[in-house]
């Protein structure tokens, strides 16, 4: 069987969504009304991976995009890039460890932890209309805590 | 024993609004991931509301967006749907239930709460 | 979405008959089905998960089969305590929904 996939939206715990910026970048901003239309929607699939009951892997795509969230070195840092992929192929069940992220909930709580890179979180900043970004921080002033809205096929 | 009882269901004019609680007893609810599923009169079955076992998460389908809203305490075991701008479509019996979005049945039910919606 | 129609809707059977309901997805639902049975003023009640796996507890006699989008729900040998409303359930893909049910009945 193919991999289940479902589709969501996220905001971080300040309310801000997530849109596109670019072709290949996100940014966080606050949306109200008619523009929460142009928040980005995920196509959420669950993946092959070490799972709890708090941790679930998943890999991050755009709906009906062949782009899907994933995290490299750059210039020796962990950073989180969107990458363009052949959709024959994706989303699988097997999915490279770049492209995987541990769905972590704890007390009303969900962090993304890249599962290449444990203790590096999807992330965004206090401000508004910054890009989307892999963190090495829990707790400080970046933000790494997400809700999660998932939306009908 | 696990169980799961409802309450706050009754008689209400469209428009209005009503408040609906489970009670969650017998196994770890913090853990567990839960929905409100209902059933109009002598009809099938419509799933409604779903939070994840945090509260992190959520999902409606388009029939009741924007209308109702899931909530939980689990520090009080407890289960919520808020239901506002009700209308005589959502009149039926509504069950607390465990499961969600990821196991994606439910595998314990609670006797159901009727709900009427009319003038 | 996917929708889910049961067949037949309603069915009269004997105690000890074997009785198979169908649930066809619009759809490919890959396994992701369930069973409920729902008895007179009761709450439903999970049977079986992922096509065929029996929940904790369910009396052997109840089975489950299929895949892609056609699934079928037998009862080997019928017990007056089977008489209920039995729906089957996906959960591929959002929204998962219900049959419409089967009406099981004894003669």
């Known amino acids: 069987a193919p991999v289940r996939s479902l589709n969501c939206t996220l905001r971080d715990s300040q309310q801000k969504s997530l849109v596109m910026s670019g072709p290949y970048e996100l940014k966080a901003l606050h949306l109200q009304g008619q523009d929460m239309e142009q928040q980005v929607v995920f196509s959420m699939s669950f993946v092959q991976g070490e799972e709890s009951n708090d941790k679930i892997p998943v890999a991050l795509g755009l709906k009906e995009k062949n782009l899907y969230l994933s995290c490299v070195l750059k210039d020796d840092k962990p950073t989180l890039q969107l990458e363009s992929v052949d959709p024959k192929n994706y989303p699988k069940k097997k999915m490279e460890k770049r492209f995987v992220f541990n769905k972590i909930e704890i007390n009303n709580k969900l962090e993304f932890e890249s599962a290449q890179f444990p203790n590096w979180y999807i992330s965004t900043s206090q401000a508004e209309n910054m890009p989307v970004f892999l963190g090495g921080t829990k707790g400080g002033q970046d933000i790494t805590d997400f809700t999660m809205q998932f939306v009908s096929s | 024993e696990v169980q799961l009882v409802e309450s706050g269901g009754g008689v209400v004019q469209p428009g209005r609004s009503l408040r609906l609680s489970c009670s969650a007893s017998?196994?770890?609810?913090?853990?567990?991931?839960m929905s409100w599923v209902r059933q109009a009169p002598g009809k099938g079955l419509e799933w409604v509301a779903y939070?994840?076992?945090?509260?992190?998460?959520?999902y409606y389908p388009d029939s009741v967006k924007g209308r109702f809203t899931i909530s939980r305490d689990n520090s009080k075991n407890t289960l919520f749907l808020q239901m506002d701008s009700l209308r005589p479509e959502d009149t039926g019996v509504y069950y607390c239930?465990?499961?969600?979005?990821?196991?994606?049945?439910?595998?314990?039910w609670g006797q159901g709460t009727p709900v009427t919606v009319s003038s | 979405g996917i929708q889910m129609t049961q067949s037949p809707s309603s069915l009269s059977a004997s105690v000890g008959d074997r009785v198979t309901i169908t649930c066809r997805a619009s759809?490919?639902?890959?396994?992701?089905l369930t069973w409920y049975q729902q008895t007179p003023g009761k709450a439903p009640k999970l049977l079986i998960y992922n096509a065929k796996t029996l929940a904790d507890g369910v009396p052997s006699r109840f089975s489950g089969s299929g895949s892609g989008t056609d699934y079928t729900f037998t009862i080997s040998s019928l017990q007056p305590e089977d008489i209920a409303t039995y729906y089957c359930q996906h959960f591929w893909t959002l929204p998962y929904t219900f049959g419409q049910g089967t009406k099981l009945q004894i003669t």
């Open positions: 239930a465990r499961g969600g979005v990821y196991k994606g049945y439910f595998d314990v």
């Open positions: 017998g196994f770890i609810f913090s853990k567990y991931d």
């Open positions: 759809g490919n639902i890959y396994t992701y």
């Open positions: 939070i994840s076992h945090g509260g992190a998460g959520t």
